[in-house]
Amino acid sequence: QPDAINAAVTCCYNFTNRKISVQRLASYRRITSSKCPKEAVIFKTIVAKEICADPKQKWVQDSMDHLDKQTQTPKT
């Protein structure tokens, strides 16, 4: 779970150790603040839960790519 260290900055201290199917993911944001101990990706899931993930993992990169494509494709 991400932790808010103040109103503006949210950090991740632990990463999920289990891959989540992209079907269960709604969006993501990157955490790159120097105030945080590590770079991270926070996925927002279909049930509105935020989950910290390691941006170095392939499934995380693939999921971000997939979500990027989804947002670029206009819904008809």
Epitope: R18, K19, I20, S21, Q23, R24, T45, V47, K49
Partner: antibody, heavy 119, light 109 residues
Framework: QVQLVQSGAEVKKPGSSVKVSCKAS????????TSWVRQAPGQGLEWMGG????????NYAQKFQGRVTITADESTSTAYMELSSLRSEDTAVYYC????????????WGQGTLVTVSS | EIVLTQSPATLSLSPGERATLSCRAS???????LAWYQQKPGQAPRLLIY???DRAEGVPARFSGSGSGTDFTLTISSLEPEDFAVYYC??????????FGQGTKVEIK
């Protein structure tokens, strides 16, 4: 430890309806779902449908579409399964089972409710 | 709908022997979202394996899962008397459409 406790056995007449409840305790309810699985005597497991509690909308196996209604009450951490137009082939043990909506495996199961349909 | 076909229907083995159960899917099971359950007479099913190969909490190490795509296997390395039961595979790719295999009964020879 998560526990799912189901309502008791039922004997029903053909054409009637049955409503089975499943009360969860010992864990969070919101980002989880409840699946309903039935097992006719001597047969395998058959998925009937499920509901993700935070959404409140259910999905059903095609076979049961129009005859089954699955609901959940977050305030009491209880899920319900109602099956209508009962026939003798609906005689079975009905199980509720919990799943994390981020994944899907059924990690905790109720004890089962025997529904007997007989005239 | 993804159809899961388990084989064999019945496996007759002695305690101490190795059991190999197969589950074949009619379509690719993405993310290896496949589980195995054990069911004993008069009891609810119990989760053994999730994500094709991860053991659930409290499950003995003699149970292992493997496979990906359309072919999955549950192996019991050395059967204990309490392992004689029915085993089911289950796919959970789509939250709106779960399916189970028809089961494999592991019985004492």
């Amino acid at each position: 430890q998560v526990q799912l406790v189901q309502s008791g056995a039922e004997v029903k007449k053909p054409g009637s309806s049955v409503k089975v409840s499943c009360k969860a305790s010992g864990g969070t309810f919101s980002h989880y779902g409840t699946s309903w699985v039935r097992q006719a005597p001597g047969q395998g497991l058959e998925w009937m449908g499920g509901i993700i509690h935070i959404f409140g909308t259910a999905n059903y196996a095609q076979k049961f579409q129009g005859r089954v209604t699955i609901t959940a009450d977050e305030s009491t951490s209880t899920a319900y399964m109602e099956l209508s137009s009962l026939r003798s082939e609906d005689t079975a043990v009905y199980y509720c089972a919990r799943y994390d909506a981020h994944y899907g495996e059924l990690d905790f199961w109720g004890q089962g409710t025997l529904v007997t349909v007989s005239s | 709908e993804i159809v899961l076909t388990q084989s064999p229907a019945t496996l007759s083995l002695s305690p101490g022997e190795r059991a190999t159960l197969s589950c074949r899917a009619s379509q690719h099971v993405s993310d290896a979202y496949l589980a195995w359950y054990q069911q004993k007479p008069g009891q609810a099913p119990r989760l053994l394996i999730y994500d094709a190969s991860d053991r659930a909490e409290g499950v003995p190490a003699r149970f292992s899962g493997s496979g990906s795509g359309t072919d999955f296997t549950l192996t019991i390395s050395s059967l204990e008397p309490e392992d004689f039961a029915v085993y089911y595979c289950h796919q959970y790719i789509h939250l709106h459409s779960f399916t189970f295999g028809q089961g494999t009964k592991v019985e004492i020879k």
